[in-house]
Interface confidence: medium
Amino acid sequence: LEVQVPEDPVVALVGTDATLRCSFSPEPGFSLAQLNLIWQLTDTKQLVHSFTEGRDQGSAYANRTALFLDLLAQGNASLRLQRVRVADEGSFTCFVSIRDFGSAAVSLQVAAPYSKPSMTLEPNKDLRPGDTVTITCSSYRGYPEAEVFWQDGQGAPLTGNVTTSQMANEQGLFDVHSVLRVVLGANGTYSCLVRNPVLQQDAHGSITITPQRSPTGAVEVQVPEDPVVALVGTDATLRCSFSPEPGFSLAQLNLIWQLTDTKQLVHSFTEGRDQGSAYANRTALFLDLLAQGNASLRLQRVRVADEGSFTCFVSIRDFGSAAVSLQVAAPYSKPSMTLEPNKDLRPGDTVTITCSSYRGYPEAEVFWQDGQGAPLTGNVTTSQMANEQGLFDVHSVLRVVLGANGTYSCLVRNPVLQQDAHGSVTITGQPMTFPPEA
């Protein structure tokens, strides 16, 4: 017996009625006395509703189900589920037995729209540029779990310091709270979009913050113009200074270091005390020098991933900021040279010379020269591969036809450190083996 149900899930809003469609094709002469119809939960096999022995046996599911009795004889075995709840979500199986037997399962997808988000700001008074604020976006009584997106006033995504929590209430509906922690600029709009993925319904809220600026003008924050170059594994100081006024005390100071691009918090000093490192516990301030206006940041055990721009925000009564660039570097090892083939070499043979140098950063520049210092720019292939730490191994291959004799040297240059590492190989005119035998 062929039993037909919709392929796609039936989507029903919480509190409304849903129809789980199910149909069969009755043969001529069919009477309801022959029909056994059973609806049950697919997974648990719990009885939901049944029609047997020529009559409706009623709902076994919280008295919220009904059949379309006047349509049963035409093959309509659909089930009406009233006042849908989150707990109803799932698969329902429609069993139909006349002389033959057939069944099919239909999915119920429950949904509830999210409310328009309410936006709260903490702190919400006397805000100044450079202050760190927490913006909370709350939307209520939705189902299923929401997707939450944050954007700035230009529509750019804010993916930085966001924490989203979703809690189900007794009815299984979710309240979503998404918290964005952000350092205020001169002004800004922050918007939150809460999406119901089933209903494709968007609810959004936004908040525009215009911090107060002191009429006396901005704090002048000074940083080095040139990038700070630091070797991998060493400590780096990102210099930043301001000029404290007479009577200045650290209780007045808000100092925030953050990554310029992503706005990720790195380190802060607020409310008169060091709030510590938010950056892998590898940063420190020069606390004994802060009162003199030294806001510099110490970054320990520098890694390739640290490279980039760091912004130093200083807020006292006024506000100022400046960005300093960190350029990470690592010296390349002395190149090792290999020759292929390396036995019985004669003038006119074509050989491949490989120059390998390891664990440098950033990518190297590779130069080949002959014994007179003239460049060899011919048949050279250079590849550079980064390891897990982001350090590069460089392999440069020179393919050359041997002359009567010759020296071939490879120079690996670190463009940031202007450090050169070089290796060379000398091939004489007589038949020879490389490396020369003792």
């Epitope: 997106f149 954007q151 230009q154 529509g155 995504p157 993916t159 709009t189 918007s191 979009l193």
Partner: antibody, heavy 121, light 106 residues
């Protein structure tokens, strides 16, 4: 009428730089970000980066970060894109576009007419 | 990076046909925009914020969404609809476009 008018076509040698301008009119230049998008011959659209003319904040596609500089002159309502170390694969039409809309929905509502940059030795 | 994959890349159809173009995102996006481009011209905004028609775009265009799959439908193709269509997102950096779907006259 809101318009973005770009500078004329350029022919450049490999290794050189090009600077394309985009003059805005008919709206407040500092109120919207200007993005740069390129399109190689017969290819799709590729985002280069954007500048906020008000704050002069920039953000770049990592692919272009090392070779691209975006600037804006508020006094002339003009945005600039400079691309250095040109290679033949940089041959493309370069568009500036205004990213507009209302929170939280944004899109490129106005595009420049495009500037053809040809890199050839 | 969020990748946007459009299918098909090329589509031949006749005036009056109903056609669909799909843009699949590699992860959830907060909204999707669509642009129309004709040869030798700049792109034009076509659909913004997932399903809103830009100014002057006829109502035969519509978008439906299922998960991360956005489907642009033209209910009855007109001669002026033959062009290349691009989807675009900026839910996370970098901003990305689909590779484009070129709609040609059969």
């Amino acid at each position: 009428e809101v318009q973005l008018v770009q500078s004329g076509a350029e022919v450049k040698k490999p290794g050189s730089s090009v600077k394309v301008s985009c003059k805005a009119s008919g709206y407040s230049f500092t109120s919207y970000t200007i993005h740069w998008v390129r399109q190689a011959p017969g290819q799709g659209l590729e985002w280069i980066g954007y500048i906020n003319p008000n704050s002069r904040n920039t953000d770049y596609n990592q692919k272009f970060k090392d070779r691209t500089t975006l600037t804006a002159d508020r006094s002339t309502s003009t945005a600039y894109m400079e691309l250095s170390s040109l290679r033949s694969e940089d041959t493309a039409v370069y568009y500036c576009a205004r990213y507009s809309g209302s929170t939280p929905y944004w899109y490129f509502d106005v595009w420049g007419q495009g500037t053809t940059v040809t890199v050839s030795s | 990076d969020i990748q946007l994959t459009q299918s098909p890349s090329f589509l031949s159809a006749s005036v009056g046909d109903r056609v669909t173009i799909t843009c699949r995102a590699s992860s959830s996006v907060s909204y999707m925009n669509w642009y129309q481009q004709k040869p030798g011209k700049s792109p034009k905004p076509w659909i913004y914020a997932t399903s809103n028609l830009a100014s002057g775009v006829p109502s035969r265009f519509s978008v439906s969404v299922s998960g991360t799959e956005h489907t642009l439908t033209i209910s009855s193709l007109q001669p002026e609809d033959f062009a290349t269509y691009y989807c675009q997102q900026w839910s996370s950096n970098p901003l990305t476009f689909g590779q484009g779907t070129k709609l040609e006259i059969k």
